[in-house]
Interface confidence: medium
């Protein structure tokens, strides 16, 4: 609502949506119900899974994914095909800047897409999303000049995270509100799989405990975790197979050394 | 930090106009829903407007609708209330304020607007 | 349109629980915020999603929402929570506020 995409994605690869109202964020309405249903992500040109509160919010809101990729993928219903979302960065490049919540003052850096430049932010210590770097070089090598290399569209290396940031990260509650603790990820692994199976479970803002699983970067396992109905992240599945099947394929052991503790 | 100041308002007579200003800085302004809230003298809060998105779609209380135009200027991080045909009952401080979500998280100090002939 | 209901005063002793109420036929649905104000002050908000509290927020605010009463309440009461407190939802589109509330702190 208060963040919504931009009608176009001129800027977010060479597929156009269907309608304007395929560009929208994901919008889960000022009210409480949980009602699973699905919207099209302009970043990953994919159709997904929110939890939507039952009242206003916006158009982009299916309630299956074959409606969603009917009325938003362009030649869904004749080739049955995935859309491919053409971008070489991780999507949460592309992500508008969130100082969050907290009322702190940090010195960091994102991705401005306008500009396809990394810019300094104030953020405000808690929340927030993954357009967040610590460093203005950590910025530019994971967004700015992504890598380019064989492996498939969107994958980052768990290396690229494993430095002193707060970009992957364990969660902690204070106040209330989900604030980043210490990163506590694996030195010897490489993940290059979907981003989102890097973030911290995350179990929302709202008040229902909905039993989730969320896949554990460190371990390389899906873990159960209390979903509170809404907001959170998409590292978030409703079953242990659903998780393991969308992230542990990206896991790639290396063949030295295990897992630095 | 984030920080919203609010300016223009002064002593109008009815039937006048005014065109308040908030200067927002310390974040990415273009990415948030704006609106002005009112607070008469001793009296409770009272939404006037709201700016929302990248189509800058606008909303107005009725007591409002056709005598206030809400607009914004991303490249000057400011937003405007245009205020015509302006009562007695418009007197109050205006407050700009930034939506979060579903809630105001920041607020400006306000600035006082009172009509009066 | 939706009313919220608050009411127009409280009173409570320094170091006892505060309760203010915000009544409306849909707050059973809607999300509830509490916003504080004191004198000559813009407002702030103390709780948002019925429930969660700012960081920088005392932990003595807390907010509950269920039937179509948001309730904030403030535990050991001390004399700088005096203000007025506004409850805020959302209806068709647009926010509303509660009338407010005056909290005042006796003694």
């Known amino acids: 609502l208060s963040e919504e995409a931009d009608d176009t994605d001129s800027e977010l690869g060479s597929m156009k949506p269907l309608h304007t109202f395929c560009a929208m964020k994901a919008d889960d309405g000022p009210c409480k119900a949980m009602i699973r249903s699905y919207f099209f992500n302009m970043y990953t040109h994919q159709c997904e899974e929110f939890i939507y509160g039952g009242c206003e919010g916006n158009e982009n809101r299916f309630d299956t994914l074959e409606e969603c990729k009917k009325t938003c993928i362009p030649g869904y219903e004749k080739t049955a095909v995935k859309a491919a979302s053409g971008a070489e960065r991780p999507d949460f490049c592309f992500l508008e800047e969130d100082p969050g919540l907290c009322r702190g003052y940090m010195k960091r850096y994102l991705y401005n897409n306008q500009t396809k430049q990394c810019e300094r932010f104030v953020y405000g210590g808690c929340l927030g999303n993954r357009n967040n770097f610590e460093t203005l070089d950590e910025c530019k090598k994971i967004c700015e000049n992504p890598v380019h290399s064989p492996s498939p569209v969107n994958e980052v290396q768990m290396s690229d995270y494993v430095t002193d940031g707060n970009t992957v990260t364990d969660r902690s509650t204070v106040n209330n509100i989900v604030v980043p603790q210490s990163p506590k990820v694996p030195r010897r692994r490489d993940y290059r799989g979907r981003p989102w199976c890097l973030q911290p479970a995350d179990s929302g803002l709202c008040k229902a405990s909905e039993r989730r699983f969320y896949y554990n970067s460190a371990t390389g396992k899906c873990h159960r975790f209390n979903y509170t109905g809404c907001g959170g992240n998409n590292n978030n599945f409703t079953t242990r197979r659903r998780c393991l099947r969308s992230c542990k394929t990206g896991l790639i052991k290396n063949k030295s050394k295990g897992v630095v503790k | 930090q984030v920080q919203l100041v609010e300016s223009g308002g002064g002593l109008v007579q009815p039937g006048g106009s005014l065109r308040l200003s908030c200067a927002a800085s310390g974040f990415t302004f273009r990415s948030y829903g704006m609106d002005w809230v009112r607070q008469a003298p001793g009296k409770g809060l009272e939404w006037v407007s709201s700016?929302?998105?990248?189509?800058?779609?606008?909303y107005y209380a009725d007591s409002v609708k056709g005598r206030f135009t809400i607009s914004r200027d991303n490249s000057k991080n400011t937003l405007y209330l245009q205020m015509n045909s302006l009562r007695a009952e418009d007197t109050a401080v205006y407050y700009c304020?930034?939506?979060?979500?579903?809630?105001?998280?920041?607020w400006g100090q306000g600035t006082l607007v009172t009509v009066s002939s | 349109d939706i009313e919220l209901t608050q009411p127009p005063s409280v009173s409570v002793a320094p170091g006892q629980t505060a309760r203010i109420s915000c009544s409306g036929d849909n707050l059973r649905k809607y999300y509830a915020h509490w916003y504080q104000q004191k004198p000559g002050q813009a407002p702030v908000v103390v709780i948002f999603?019925?429930?969660n509290r700012p960081s920088g927020i005392p932990e003595r605010f807390s907010g509950s929402n269920s039937g179509n009463t948001a309730t904030l309440t403030i535990s050991g009461t001390q004399a700088e929570d005096e203000a007025d407190y506004y409850c805020q939802s959302w209806w068709d589109g647009v926010p509303v506020f509660g009338g407010g509330t005056k909290l005042t702190v006796l003694g």
């Open positions: 999603y019925d429930v």
């Open positions: 700016i929302r998105g990248s189509r800058s779609s606008t």
């Open positions: 304020a930034r939506l979060y979500r579903y809630w105001f998280d920041y």
